[in-house]
Every structure is written in structure tokens, then in C-alpha cells.
Interface confidence: low
């Protein structure tokens, strides 16, 4: 069998055996090397030779195998915007960026451009957890049979009501979605308004 | 069809300048890098420079023999590449060709004939 | 800058001869050769790239062969319309180089 062309090679059906790899060149109808992620193309191919990759300037980068003349300048993350930095800048990955805590993403355009506060949980609810952090606001679900949760927060969570006679307490007053169990030692007497149905 | 005109040749004397102009149509010459190659009367084909695409910087290379007293530019908006020739001196008569540089040239125009002489 | 020889410098040679140049370069350069013809009072015309590939509307009779410095250009069958002469050009580095031509004459 024939040898593979290795590029530059004709191609008359404008097509490359390598999409990932190779890009149609189409003034001289000829299959050309991309240059891999980190580099970028300092001369174009021709019918005799093929293109020539240049690595990435500090401080830029290209992603994919590529046939840019340019690398892609790196931009820090915006703290006006919220997000933050989880990972710096490479030759071959763009800086990644996510919103701070305590915001989510208002504004994506393949990747989150604007963060925002989360919404405030009322007491008795809590912000239903999601897949990724910082995705969307909060959609705040109420608090399960037993627990609590008595901040208007963003991010605090449901907690189980006390149980008193793990403290060797007896319950004063039932637990509610918005408050804990009130608990009491057992010798106290019982407050005032209660005494009376004790009289014989 | 792809077609390269060059124009502007003529006499001049020696310390003299000339501009020659290359038009080109048939092909995308934004896309092109150009250059200029050379024949003395008589005599084999010398390079004489060329220019990239402005996608490539736009950038020039000049042979020896000419640096320095020759200038290369090309205006994309109107397919047009130029040749600015300054301190002409005798051994610069020639005819002068423009052409499509691929690395091969590919596509030449008629030549234009520069002649230094007093 | 990287010389090129070309020989002959000229020859005499018959329709439906095999007609042979040859060029060689000072150093290596790959298979960054090309050939052209010209014809008096015309512009050079481009033959073969690459060493060896056949310009599109190029007769087949014109071959290329050879890589590194030693590069040659045959004529299978030499047509009337092929006296001319010849120059080998390489594009491996700046500034690109010609050969000094070979003429091929009607013997």
C-alpha cells in the first residue's frame, strides 16, 4: 500500500484526513498542519512547506490545535465582576475562573462573564444544593420534618432539631422549621401558666 | 484567470528613483505573500525581496545588493503591490517582475524594464 | 545565502532526445527546489515544485527528482516548444537563490 501523504497534500475534495489536526488551505488547494495547543502558526504553509508553529508569549495561549497567527491574550478574573482565579494562565489553557462564594453566575457566554450575590433563605428554608458551585441563585426549599434553620442567610443550612433527653433534658417547647427544640432540666418546676392544671 | 500587470519602468539616471507598481487580480492578495525577482540583460533571475500578508505581520526581506535603498509595500485595498527604488545605480537596470511567493512562484507578471543610465 | 550550480551551462540537444539538467546547493535543503523555464522576451514559467511535483498544465515528459543538494530535471522527450532555458530556485532560506540557467538549444 501507498505511503499516507504527510502534509502539505492536494486535495481536491477540499476535505483533510485530520480535522483535528490539518485545515484545508484553499488559494492552493492543499491540506496543511494545525499547530498544537500552545502554539500558534509564525509562517503559513505552502505547496512545498508546511506550516510553522512558534510557541506561545508569556502571558498568551491557544487552546486547540489551531492555524491562528496569534495567540490569545490571558486575562486575569474580575473581582468587579466576582469571580476569582482556580487555576492560572498556561501557554495552553486560558486562566480559569469561578464566581466567589456567596455569588453565582448572572452572565455566560461559554464561560461566566458576571457574578452576582445569591438570594438570601428566609428562616425555615435552605438553598437547594446543586451540581456546581456558583451555577445558579438560590431556590430555597424548606426545611425538612426535624430541622431548622432561623437566619435569613445565603448559605446556611437546615440543622436537626436538639433532642433534649440526649442532653438528659426534658423538651420545654417543641421544635419548628424556623426554631430549635427549647429544652429543660428536669427538676425545674413548670413556668406559671402551667402550674394551675397541676392543683388537686 | 490570474493576472499580474507591472507598470512604472522607464530611464533614470544613476543616484535617481522609481516606483513600480504590480496589479493584481485573479486570486485573494490578501492572502498572498509577493515578491520582486530581477533579469539583467542578458543575464540568470535574482531576488530582489518581497513582502508578507499583513496577517503574517507584513513584514519585509530584502536581498543584499538592494537593502537599504529599496522599499516594498503593498495596499491590499487595491491589489496593488509596489516597488520604491531609491539611489539607483547601473547595475540596477533589469527587468523587474512581480510574483506570487508560495515558495514557488507561481504566477509572474510581464516584467517592467528599468534602465539606469546617464 | 546558499549557492546553487547548475550544469550544464548549456546544451545542444534534438527533438525526441532525453534532456538532463542538474542542480546541487551548498548545504542541504530538504526538497525546497523548483524549476522553471524561460523563453526570450517571456517571464519564467513554474515547472515543478517541491523537488519532484508537476505544476497543474505542465507536461508529464518534465520529471523532478532529488532531495538534500543534489536535485535534477529531465525532459523524457524533447518537444520543439521545449527550447528554452532552465533555472533551479530554492526556497529553503532567505534569500532564496536561482541557479545561473542552462540553455537548451536545437542541435
Known amino acids: 500500500s501507498q505511503p499516507q501523504a504527510v502534509p502539505p497534500y492536494a486535495s481536491e475534495n477540499q476535505t483533510c484526513r485530520d480535522q483535528e489536526k490539518e485545515y484545508y488551505e484553499p488559494q492552493h488547494r492543499i491540506c496543511c498542519s494545525r499547530c498544537p495547543p500552545g502554539t500558534y502558526v509564525s509562517a503559513k504553509c505552502s505547496r512545498i512547506r508546511d506550516t510553522v508553529c512558534a510557541t506561545c508569549a508569556e502571558n498568551s495561549y491557544n487552546e486547540h490545535w489551531n492555524y491562528l497567527t496569534i495567540c490569545q491574550l490571558c486575562r486575569p478574573c474580575d473581582p468587579v465582576m466576582g469571580l476569582e482565579e482556580i487555576a492560572p494562565c498556561t501557554s495552553k489553557r486560558k486562566t480559569q475562573c469561578r464566581c466567589q462564594p456567596g455569588m453565582f453566575c448572572a452572565a455566560w457566554a461559554l464561560e461566566c462573564t458576571h457574578c452576582e450575590l445569591l438570594s438570601d433563605c428566609p428562616p425555615g428554608t435552605e438553598a437547594e444544593l446543586k451540581d456546581e458551585v456558583g451555577k445558579g441563585n438560590n431556590h430555597c426549599v424548606p426545611c425538612k420534618a426535624g430541622h431548622f434553620q432561623n437566619t435569613s442567610s445565603p448559605s446556611a443550612r437546615c440543622q436537626p432539631h436538639t433532642r433534649c433527653e440526649n442532653q438528659g433534658l426534658v423538651e420545654a417547647a417543641p421544635g419548628t422549621a424556623q426554631s430549635d427544640t427549647t429544652c429543660k432540666n428536669p427538676l425545674e418546676p413548670l413556668p406559671p401558666e402551667m402550674s394551675g392544671t397541676m392543683l388537686m | 484567470e490570474v493576472q499580474l500587470v507591472e507598470s512604472g519602468g522607464g530611464l533614470v539616471k544613476p543616484g535617481g528613483s522609481l516606483r513600480l507598481s504590480c496589479a493584481a487580480s485573479g486570486f485573494t492578495f490578501n492572502d498572498a505573500w509577493m515578491s520582486w525577482v530581477r533579469q539583467a540583460p542578458g543575464k540568470g533571475l535574482e531576488w530582489v525581496g518581497r513582502i508578507k500578508t499583513k496577517t503574517d505581520g507584513g513584514t519585509t526581506d530584502y536581498a543584499a545588493p538592494v537593502k537599504g535603498r529599496i522599499t516594498i509595500s503593498r495596499d491590499d485595498s487595491k491589489n496593488t503591490l509596489y516597488l520604491q527604488m531609491n539611489s539607483l545605480k547601473t547595475e540596477d537596470t533589469a527587468v523587474y517582475y512581480c510574483?506570487?511567493?508560495?515558495?514557488?512562484?507561481?504566477?509572474w507578471g510581464q516584467g517592467t524594464l528599468v534602465t539606469v543610465s546617464s | 545565502d546558499i549557492q546553487m550550480t547548475q550544469s550544464p551551462s548549456s546544451l545542444s540537444a534534438s527533438v525526441g532526445d532525453r534532456v538532463t539538467i542538474t542542480c546541487r546547493t551548498s548545504?542541504?535543503?530538504?526538497?525546497?527546489l523548483n524549476w522553471y523555464q524561460q523563453k526570450p522576451g517571456k517571464a519564467p514559467k513554474l515547472l515543478i515544485y517541491g523537488a519532484s511535483s508537476l505544476q497543474s498544465g505542465v507536461p508529464s515528459r518534465f520529471s523532478g527528482s532529488g532531495s538534500g543538494t543534489d536535485f535534477t530535471l529531465t525532459i523524457s522527450s524533447l518537444q520543439p516548444e521545449d527550447f528554452a532555458t532552465y533555472y533551479c530556485h530554492q526556497s529553503y532560506s532567505t534569500p532564496p537563490t536561482f541557479g545561473q540557467g542552462t540553455k537548451v538549444e536545437i542541435k
Open positions: 548545504q542541504s535543503i530538504s526538497r525546497y
Open positions: 510574483t506570487t511567493d508560495y515558495g514557488d512562484y507561481e504566477y
